[in-house]
């Protein structure tokens, strides 16, 4: 079950795990997106452009992700189901300048064991 103040599109179940979508403005060309659970950084993705507009992606925490021109989706395979946790996205903008840092969408996520069980059965 998804609880809290976030837009429900931020969270969706996916193959026994949770997909968390962090949206950002299409105007933004170079960025760093971080996903937090409370104060812990779970995932970090940096998109930059080099010469000839070649895109470089850095994913130092080796998270499963999907990047589009207005969102980064992170896939958590083993979400903490013991208690409700607050997840939020933090966006750092490098282009267009000047540098901006913003905490964006966030919300509480409470996952019941039965949900993961059912999702897992479907996946298997």
């Amino acid at each position: 079950e998804i609880n809290g103040s976030a837009d429900h599109r931020m969270f969706s179940f996916h193959n026994g795990g949770v997909q968390i979508s962090c949206k950002y403005p299409e105007t933004v060309q170079q960025l760093k997106m971080r996903l937090f659970r409370e104060r812990e950084v779970l995932c970090e993705l940096t998109k930059t452009k080099g010469s000839g507009n070649a895109v470089s992606i850095k994913n130092p925490m080796l998270c499963l992700y999907h990047l589009s021109n207005n969102s980064v989706s992170f896939f958590l395979n083993n979400p903490d189901s013991s208690q409700g946790s607050y997840y939020f996205c933090s966006l750092s903008i490098f282009d267009p300048p000047p540098f901006q840092e913003r905490n964006l969408s966030g919300g509480y996520l409470h996952i019941y064991e039965s949900q993961l069980c059912c999702q897992l059965k479907l996946w298997l």
Epitope: C22, K23, Y24, P25, T27, V28, Q29, N70, C89, L91, I93, D95, P96, P97, P98, F99, Q100, E101, R102, L104, S105
Partner: antibody, heavy 125, light 109 residues
Framework: EVQLVESGGGLVQPGGSLRLSCAAS????????MHWVRQATGKGLEWVSA???????YYPGSVKGRFTISRENAKNSLYLQMNSLRAGDTAVYYC???????????????????WGQGTTVTVSS | EIVLTQSPGTLSLSPGERATLSCRAS???????LAWYQQKPGQAPGLLIF???SRATGIPDRFSGSGSGTDFTLTISRLEPEDFAVYYC??????????FGQGTKLEIK
Amino acid sequence: EVQLVESGGGLVQPGGSLRLSCAASGFTFSSYDMHWVRQATGKGLEWVSAIGTAGDTYYPGSVKGRFTISRENAKNSLYLQMNSLRAGDTAVYYCVRDKRTVTHEHYYYYGMDVWGQGTTVTVSS
Amino acid sequence: EIVLTQSPGTLSLSPGERATLSCRASQSISSSSLAWYQQKPGQAPGLLIFGASSRATGIPDRFSGSGSGTDFTLTISRLEPEDFAVYYCQQFGSSPMCSFGQGTKLEIK
């Protein structure tokens, strides 16, 4: 009242230096990106430099390496250190506030919404 | 590098007429990044329009902005004596971070 007041302009010889100051009041200075924009007599507006809220700085090629923008949030002040001045740097220099906000879906640019009255810099021998 | 070109350089009209000022970008820009300014003799510029079409605080509704991509327009529906001034378009972006058009002088015919 939201206000920007420039000072420090004057006459300087080519190759010389000058430091411009801008005193901000009436708003939370540290929350805004700031710019210097100049205008030579009878000419158009030219962007000179910018500084972000995090202290990151930006310059066009025409002044890069010669001009340095800085800010002192505790004093609500913006500065422009100008070195190796040339005749082509002669202009009125404006201190300008830039307003923008970011949400998860939109990057809103509200334009340069507050301008100072300008300070005149003359580079001549 | 994005270059903004304004036309005409000078526009001669009479009070009560409609003024149409053009700003063309050398490459496509986001409409949210375009602004217009008015400058009267001996004064600092003032913000008129932001986001290509949104009027700044206190700007009369006879001023309107439109356009997208590379072509943007500032329209003054019915000129008042105080509207005769120089108008600049401006964009924020990456290279350079900020640039202005060369200006359009709106003068009394």
